[in-house]
Amino acid sequence: MAVTACQGLGFVVSLIGIAGIIAATCMDQWSTQDLYNNPVTAVFNYQGLWRSCVRESSGFTECRGYFTLLGLPAMLQAVRALMIVGIVLGAIGLLVSIFALKCIRIGSMEDSAKANMTLTSGIMFIVSGLCAIAGVSVFANMLVTNFWMSTANMYTGMGGMVQTVQTRYTFGAALFVGWVAGGLTLIGGVMMCIACRGLAPEETNYKAVSYHASGHSVAYKPGGFKASTGFGSNTKNKKIYDGGARTEDEVQSYPSKHDYV
């Protein structure tokens, strides 16, 4: 039960995280015009990974795509790449994890296969989350560097008389969305990996071993089996679990040791 809950929760958290990574990647507000300690302008500039926008005081917004590929800064290209890799890995991870979910029955899929798929999707989510966090952090670092550079040259004099105000950019909403989304995807991935451990079948063969004591006959069984005395009518060894008792005879495959938590 706990395994299913952990896996399901991991899936949902990752799903929200990946949706957030996609949203952040598409958002235009990766960097926004810094309004603090800056001459107040009647236009507001903000930039995304794919286009830059200008909003006039009337609300009129004009966005222009970055139609060049070679002319863009290498850092921006790197951030784009990291975010796309994160989305692709996350999407594949989601696809894999759907089939790995314990609550979904697909043919006669073995628990070991589900465990492997859960682990695979978990790792994919972790890498996806790390890619998003890395991408957003690289962009944030780029902003911080540019911010202080533009602060140092905020007013570039022209003949000592005319001043040109350099627009400074600060963190946009997309950065925070990206950090949170990356974190959620990472957490979801970790949860999937934890769930995988619970799904993985134990290799130990649960065979009964009898130890004959000097008194009356008592069979001790390893692995959580209840000791049964030879006096009562209970002649079969029963394993205790949440869903009721199942006799050893009825067990066809070796159950996972966490299957009955």
């Epitope: 236009v43 500039n45 005081s57 009337s58």
Partner: antibody, heavy 120, light 113 residues
Framework: QVQLQQSGAELARPGASVKMSCKAS????????IHWLKQGPGQGLEWIGY????????NYNQKFKYKATLTADKSSSTAYIQLSSLTSDDSAVYYC?????????????WGQGTSVTVSS | DIVMTQSPSSQTVTAGEKVTLSCRSS????????????LTWYQQKPGQPPKLLIY???TRESGVPDRFTGSGSGTYFTFTISSVQAEDLAVYYC?????????FGAGTKLELK
Amino acid sequence: QVQLQQSGAELARPGASVKMSCKASGYTFPTYSIHWLKQGPGQGLEWIGYINPSTIYTNYNQKFKYKATLTADKSSSTAYIQLSSLTSDDSAVYYCAREGYGRGNAMDYWGQGTSVTVSS
Amino acid sequence: DIVMTQSPSSQTVTAGEKVTLSCRSSQSLLNGGNQKNYLTWYQQKPGQPPKLLIYWASTRESGVPDRFTGSGSGTYFTFTISSVQAEDLAVYYCQNAYFYPFTFGAGTKLELK
């Protein structure tokens, strides 16, 4: 067609207050900001401030911060400017103007102006 | 506040003549985000409110005759009337539409010779 109809001329005593109106028609009033400008006799234009009727957000020129108060009534599609503690320096023609959409923050339609004379 | 300096303060012209008015701003009105200059030109005839002619330094308002053109970038702008007509006699104002508070030049008065 778009029209901004301003109230009639005002004659006021020094220290008094006046409230002028600017009734908009021919467009959706809350969608466009209304700017107010002052033009002294034989002088240039001075920007007082603007109001966004939709949000009631106002932005004032610091010079007029304590002189002018901008308000708007969406139900009657009317913008108002109140000038307080009048002095002879406030004698001027006051214009209301609509900020155009996608016009580089320019004012595309203007009222005919309201003349304010401050005299004892 | 941004200071807008217009020159000349007045100019005497004859019908059909080409006229160029200039406007300087104390700070650049060029927005890097869209590479547009937030400078506006208005025409004001006696007893009338100003009329929008040019915005974004060079974009003509709809209905404005094509003899009116605006140009320039950053801090220096010009306004040209290719062939002055009698109805063009008015005061022309340039306006900073980039920084608050919006500021206007003192105006250039066009008079008939």
